[in-house]
């Protein structure tokens, strides 16, 4: 199999500090998933990233950076409609054990007030493997630009795997995509969080196989209600 691209899949290192809401969920010292900072106490990620305990890396584009904040988290709340069979409603809130310190490198993500339309250019980011099927994990945060794809076009590829709270993004005839390790990380469009990396075909980066994301604009009420309820 060909090693695909050389970043995220076919991306590049993010402009330093351009994704201050991006976090990494670590299991011990190892990358488990991506995530986004919603506020000082809460991280949003994918439900399939659930663990008993998390170490959350914030404030640096480099995973091994000693200046980064590392905060433990032991409480997480999957969306009640998450299905381990269909993976619909693949999102989860993780409550930090202590508050994150906001700075130029640690900022809250903007939750969407509307769902962006197909054709919108967005950026997906993460520390997931930059090659597939063989893995190469970068230490620096990677970014790639993709476009939102209509449910009708995406259903042609994924058929009944696609559920109505799933969002597709990619570039026709391109390898640009997320991969394992990017799960739960952000798809940001016009400055707002529109998606969380959920799944895609493996090996990653197969042209015309879009990445599939949880469509965040459909869950803003649940996100706000859950944070309020578990203050």
């Amino acid at each position: 199999e060909e090693a695909q691209g050389d970043k995220i899949i076919d991306g590049a290192p993010c402009a330093r500090g351009s994704h201050p809401w991006q976090v990494a969920l670590l299991s011990g010292n190892q990358l488990h998933c991506g995530g986004v900072l919603v506020n000082e106490r809460w991280v949003l990620t994918a439900a399939h990233c659930k663990m008993n305990e998390y170490t959350v890396h914030l404030g640096s584009d480099t995973l091994g950076d000693r200046r980064a904040q590392r905060i433990k988290a032991s409480k997480s709340f999957r969306h009640p409609g998450y299905s381990t069979q269909t993976h619909v409603n693949d999102l989860m809130l993780v409550k930090l054990n202590s508050q994150a310190r906001l700075s130029s490198m640690v900022k809250k993500v903007r939750l969407p007030s509307r769902c962006e339309p197909p054709g919108t250019t967005c950026t997906v980011s993460g520390w997931g493997t930059t090659t597939s099927p063989d893995v190469t994990f970068p230490s620096d945060l990677m970014c790639v630009d993709v476009k939102l794809i209509s449910p009708q076009d995406c259903t042609k590829v994924y058929k009944d795997l696609l559920e109505n709270s799933m969002l597709c993004a990619g570039i026709p005839d391109s390898k640009k995509n997320a991969c394992n390790g990017d799960s739960g990380g952000p798809l940001v469009c016009r400055g707002t969080l529109q998606g969380l990396v959920s799944w895609g075909t493996f090996p990653c980066g197969q042209p015309n196989d879009p990445g599939v994301y949880t469509q965040v604009c459909k869950f803003t009420k649940w996100i706000n209600d859950t944070m309020k309820k578990h203050r």
Partner: antibody
């Protein structure tokens, strides 16, 4: 041609543990799922669990939860299945099998076809 | 968890016969089903994956069909080497689950 070579037969006492290994020769399994399936004498096949080394997670059948641990050593292309608190009903042939995932992320367990199998390891539990 | 019910548990047939084995899932699994053949003392062998896709090297007399909850394995013309036990397995999501098996015996 990739082959899965399993460790040899084991005789164990009730209450003890057994660890069976499964080594990929002639290739890697880091990009694959490795499943463990057992078959008691004269009985059908029973799926115990699986690991996808590069995705870093193991999944277990409810029946074995808490008693089975599946791990993988990517540097030696070897998977392991450890079963603890053995009882006589655990007497069986234990197989490992390899299959390619179709998806990463949430759907990573879906549709894996296990096309290459080990030769099986007979585990006898007897006092 | 999804349960798999396979029938019949055994079938007696002659060389040249058409043999049909069915498998029913307790809930819809789309087309995520595989069929395996096992001979005594040997490891299982993959025949069909994704309900109807023939594994490379498997003779074309084997075919699979179905989706959702009901699936069928058909051997169009039974050969001497086909006398074995056949298992279906749901591959919709972990935990995978095997059917109880169907033993194809010589009549």
């Amino acid at each position: 041609q990739v082959q899965l070579v399993q460790s040899g037969a084991e005789v164990k006492k009730p209450g003890s543990s057994v660890k069976v290994s499964c080594k990929a020769s002639g290739g890697t399994f880091n990009n694959y799922a490795i499943s463990w399936v057992r078959q008691a004498p004269g009985q059908g096949l029973e799926w115990m669990g699986a690991i996808i080394p590069i995705f870093g997670v193991a999944n277990y059948a409810q029946k074995f939860q808490g008693r089975v641990t599946i791990t993988a050593d990517e540097s030696t292309s070897t998977a392991y299945m450890e079963l603890s608190s053995l009882r006589s009903e655990d007497t069986a042939v234990y197989y490992c099998a390899r299959g390619a995932p179709n998806y990463y992320g949430a759907q990573s367990s879906r549709g894996i076809a296990f096309d290459i199998w080990g030769q099986g390891t007979m585990v006898t539990v007897s006092s | 968890d999804i349960q798999m019910t396979q029938s019949p548990s055994s079938v007696s047939a002659s060389v040249g016969d058409r043999v049909t084995i069915t498998c029913r899932a307790s809930q819809g699994i789309s087309s995520w089903l595989a069929w395996y053949q096992q001979k005594p003392g040997k490891a299982p062998k993959l025949l069909i994956y994704a309900a109807s896709s023939l594994q490379s090297g498997v003779p074309s007399r084997f075919s699979g069909s179905g989706s959702g909850t009901d699936f069928t394995l058909t051997i169009s013309s039974l050969q001497p080497e086909d006398f074995a036990t056949y298992y279906c397995v749901q591959a919709n999501a972990f935990p995978y689950k095997f059917g109880g098996g169907t033993k194809v015996e010589i009549k």
